[in-house]
Amino acid sequence: SGTTNTVAAYNLTWKSTNFKTILEWEPKPVNQVYTVQISTKSGDWKSKCFYTTDTECDLTDEIVKDVKQTYLARVFSYPAGNVESTGSAGEPLYENSPEFTPYLETNLGQPTIQSFEQVGTKVNVTVEDERTLVRRNNTFLSLRDVFGKDLIYTLYYWKSSSSGKKTAKTNTNEFLIDVDKGENYCFSVQAVIPSRTVNRKSTDSPVECMGQEKGEFREI
């Protein structure tokens, strides 16, 4: 139904990493424009991305107000140049998105190894606590702030001279591991939320190896 020259949006998809959240859809518009609305289950609809020819809408500002809420979005289609025109039912065509709960579903961004320091046969590896777009008291919260005890990191490490990997886990942003004296090691980390059923793990961080700038070696 609807006017002859508008089609409803389809394939509405949430793309979200570290709470940066964009709704995408199809098709590319031909003689039509879109407006997006977002709501919590119990809240009012709020309009965003008015009469756009884009097929995406950044909804980050809305979802970061409460990342534990469940959100629903819908995309309205209007004829280009005649946005007052409606479908046969008296309202514009629209399509609903899947429900989205940011806290449970946002992808974990690729972590970064901030530093590593060797003291004798111990190495301390520190993961950068990445800033999110979630705010409290006008301050942007870090990933650790937001996820707290739900977030762990897994460290993969191996001797530069071999391929056998070892793993360690931490519920902070730091690892303290034992290494063999005189050996160089390489490191990669991964963020994990074990309690999730989807998007449990980030991609691995870039590999950092001892003997490069990022680390510090102290013979004790």
Epitope: V67, K68, T70, F147, K149, S195
Partner: antibody, heavy 121, light 109 residues
């Protein structure tokens, strides 16, 4: 407003099981851990375990492993705690609790009214 | 399993200040232990004062504050009221489980 409504008092015989319910309302049920804490008469608080309703992920106190099971029913926003092989020392008030979320923070902010479970032959 | 230790009892004068401590048998308490402080008055359900080390609930009176001091979590009460007489429990998170302390009985006298 957040509310946690627990089921009524129970009297059980040693060796039996008890299933206590905690019905949540006023928030997004799936996103918050529900903690179970018990308090024996005249004693302190003891953590039993937790469940995240969205994924049914659970963590249990080692002391109760094998005896405690936590489940949830998302259609009714209710969490259940079942304790089996009851003994007299399980006589306690059983509480469910939920954290207050500020963008971060974890713990025991909102509490149910408690369910008294009495184990007696 | 870790043991969490609190002072069994403390006394404070009305209008006075007092610090309750929460120690961990495994070493220093850090922000990763997400210290919680819970108040319980006789015959009542527990109520939260502090979660996540230092976050007050909107219902928590401003005279209560949580922090880490040295190697332990502390709850400071500034300007005690008669109604603050209660048991106070701390709880610490250890990677995959919570542990409660034995509680501190605070008397306002």
């Amino acid at each position: 407003q957040v509310q946690l409504q627990e089921s009524g008092a129970e009297v059980k015989k040693p060796g039996a099981s008890v299933k206590v319910s905690c019905k949540a309302s006023g928030y997004t049920f799936s996103s918050y851990w529900i903690e179970w804490v018990r308090q024996a008469p005249g004693q302190g608080l003891e953590w039993m375990g937790e469940i995240l309703p969205g994924s049914a992920s659970t963590k249990y106190n080692e002391k109760f492993k094998g005896r405690v099971t936590m489940t949830r029913d998302t259609s009714t926003s209710t969490v259940y705690m079942e304790l089996s092989s009851l003994r007299s020392e399980d006589t306690a008030v059983y509480y469910c609790a939920r954290d207050y979320y500020y963008g971060s923070s974890y713990g025991f902010a909102y509490w149910g009214q408690g369910t008294l479970v009495t184990v007696s032959s | 399993q870790a043991v969490v230790t609190q002072e069994p009892s403390l006394t404070v004068s009305p209008g006075g200040s007092v610090t309750l401590t929460c120690r961990s048998s495994t070493g220093a308490v850090t922000t990763s232990n997400y210290a919680n402080w819970v108040q319980q008055k006789p015959g009542q359900t527990p109520t939260s004062l502090i979660s996540g080390t230092n976050n007050r609930g909107p219902w928590t009176p401003a005279r209560f504050s949580g922090s880490i001091l040295g190697d332990k979590a502390v709850l400071t009460l500034w300007g005690a009221h008669a109604e603050d007489e209660a048991d106070y429990f701390c709880a610490l998170w250890y990677s995959n489980h919570w542990v409660f302390g034995g509680g501190t009985k605070l008397t306002v006298l």
